[in-house]
Interface confidence: low
Amino acid sequence: SAPGEDEECGRVRDFVAKLANNTHQHVFDDLRGSVSLSWVGDSTGVILVLTTFHVPLVIMTFGQSKLYRSEDYGKNFKDITDLINNTFIRTEFGMAIGPENSGKVVLTAEVSGGSRGGRIFRSSDFAKNFVQTDLPFHPLTQMMYSPQNSDYLLALSTENGLWVSKNFGGKWEEIHKAVCLAKWGSDNTIFFTTYANGSCKADLGALELWRTSDLGKSFKTIGVKIYSFGLGGRFLFASVMADKDTTRRIHVSTDQGDTWSMAQLPSVGQEQFYSILAANDDMVFMHVDEPGDTGFGTIFTSDDRGIVYSKSLDRHLYTTTGGETDFTNVTSLRGVYITSVLSEDNSIQTMITFDQGGRWTHLRKPENSECDATAKNKNECSLHIHASYSISQKLNVPMAPLSEPNAVGIVIAHGSVGDAISVMVPDVYISDDGGYSWTKMLEGPHYYTILDSGGIIVAIEHSSRPINVIKFSTDEGQCWQTYTFTRDPIYFTGLASEPGARSMNISIWGFTESFLTSQWVSYTIDFKDILERNCEEKDYTIWLAHSTDPEDYEDGCILGYKEQFLRLRKSSVCQNGRDYVVTKQPSICLCSLEDFLCDFGYYRPENDSKCVEQPELKGHDLEFCLYGREEHLTTNGYRKIPGDKCQGGVNPVREVKDLKKKCTSNFLSPEKQNSKSN
């Protein structure tokens, strides 16, 4: 097990007194019920807390909510319910917090049955003041901010109207009726699907995809026969019904829907689904469900246009549409993703890729762990990570895996060591190199969070009993100190720290229960006095990411380049600070076949880096449909992986000729449709 408070671990000096002086309790004057917490802005210290209490009466439910505000990271709270006229706020819409540091907040109120429309409370000064606004519609969804302009809001009404506000919710205009789904794109563009005859459900597969770039003044129909659509990175995807049957296919656009190409992905039937697992401006991970109720499918990774796809991982666990998948982007190291596969014997195993889906492998067994009962060979097994699927199955897993972009290399997750995920009580494991190697960090399930860009890790044991102890580590989980933050244990409900992992404050939320009442309580602990000084140059060391063979000149090369980072030494107890920026030095690598994916018509046999022609296409001209034109491909089978920066070295030939012929994959363009009369 990991070193505890023993001879291997030096204690942080006088930490009890330092933390006691920086522990702030707040008891909320509320009956229990539900509580939700939102951070308003970045580095502002402003937190909004909404408590809601329902009293089920005989003929109706009576609700009461209270709103609290902190501007010191949760150390003190002020009841500001009077600013929203003591109105009951609908928790299912949550608190709609504006993007970036806009300081905007929208709360949606509960209104009486016969009212003409809903009601919102709006703030643009970090919740210091609110303005009440009555809506001309009843909202079906939370207000959605345009990512580019926080004054622009959109919402769907219960009558399927698409409503837009250009002045942060002061005035609303219905810009379209019969809308099923609406999303903000880039440049204040709105994409949405509409139905013509019945309803969203009845017209599924016969929806139209529309775009407005001027907030509803003008529209363009950019797709017909639509089942659904999604946005990922710079890609717009639509699943489109095929002409002759009930199957559908993915089409992709990189110009906001003006032109479409059919993705080289399998079509799916009525009971199957597509899912965008992850996307950036370079590429996309797409899950394609298997026929039948298998609970798994195949992951494909795209080229830079989102058109040509390579099979990345078979038997990928994904239960149902909108169901559970363990697919996780490890944000603390470029190119790393973790997910689960369903093996032939129906056991679940964890797989990891370090090169953006090029190759997947099992997680290396932690050196300080034994293989459990699931292992056939007690000396050979892997670490298996618990994520969304385990949580959905009500296993004793309080949290999904955690990584933060500014805590380079750190990944924390619940797991078990064996041949597959175990239903036994898991332990917590940590990787400090982005998932290459793992160490058991804590025995049993815990809640955990990263503070000060990795300078502190905080954990609380997951227990059904009341708790009053928090654990913390200043050396990336090697050694742990325990601190009793209150004499009176509380029923713990959650840890809250400011998103971005730059803060040094942690809030412990829970409730106290006495004979007659239960009340919400929070304890906010500031670790600033534990990390007494600012980190200096001597506190950092150079670390080469993705290093597996230091003797090799190409060691660390992933997607055509390697990166060296300045990492905080484990032995340094100091503050990275709120303005800490990850320091990295990239260097370009020579190209090898690993830097190329297999082109259209080619595939990579197992354990081979060469791409070979698909047997069924051998001797055929490689022609495919692109932007509605027939293209002829002259290739020796390779296309550079999206985002790969390699130069020199291997350079496979590739040429695409426009055959100047129209082709029929382009179901989507309205221009290609002969519109039928209704």
């Epitope: 009726k177 019969a178 209704n678």
Partner: antibody, heavy 122, light 107 residues
Amino acid sequence: EVQLVQSGAEVKKPGESLKISCKGSGYIFTSFWIGWVRQMPGKGLEWMGIIYPGDSDTRYSPSFQGQVTISADKSISTAYLQWSSLKASDTAMYYCARHSRGSFWYGAFQHWGQGTLVTVSS
Amino acid sequence: EIVLTQSPDFQSVTPKEKVTITCRASQSIGSSLHWYQQKPDQSPKLLIKYASQSFSGVPSRFSGSGSGTDFTLTINSLEAEDAAAYYCHQSSSLPHTFGPGTKVDIK
């Protein structure tokens, strides 16, 4: 089959009121905008306004705002155009037309009624 | 409001000839322009929607093109039954407007 059937021709005196109708069939009446178009003798088409029968949302051309009222009764799938006080210059053929999709004001007039001739003369 | 102008106002054409009618918008309307045909004593009929999409049942000799402010309706090989008035209509922004019309007759 989508059909829009308009009420018959009317002869009125200036100052009188009038309400003409347009009955829709063969489609979901409440889900498509219906517009009214005027065509004065020997002249072109003029867009007057539209109504969404689902919630009686109406949009008028500024030229006709306050001059006419567009309404709908979804229970009998009928749209109306009415005047409270006719003028001789209201003499024209009036067409109702249905938009091509159940959407906001966007789209072509895909289906047309046969027209109602209104003559206003003293 | 958006003003649509059509040219020519009138065109007299022999059968099998190609006819081109233009419609110009006072500001950009994307592809939100539609074309109608109206024969004497009949209701208008939709020919082309969204600048270039043929409406079902419309003979293939009718085609549309253009976007932004300049649009064209082309009748590739005129037939006697095509004698009619042709109107353009924008649905880009309220109020919708029609062009003044182009009358085509057969020589």
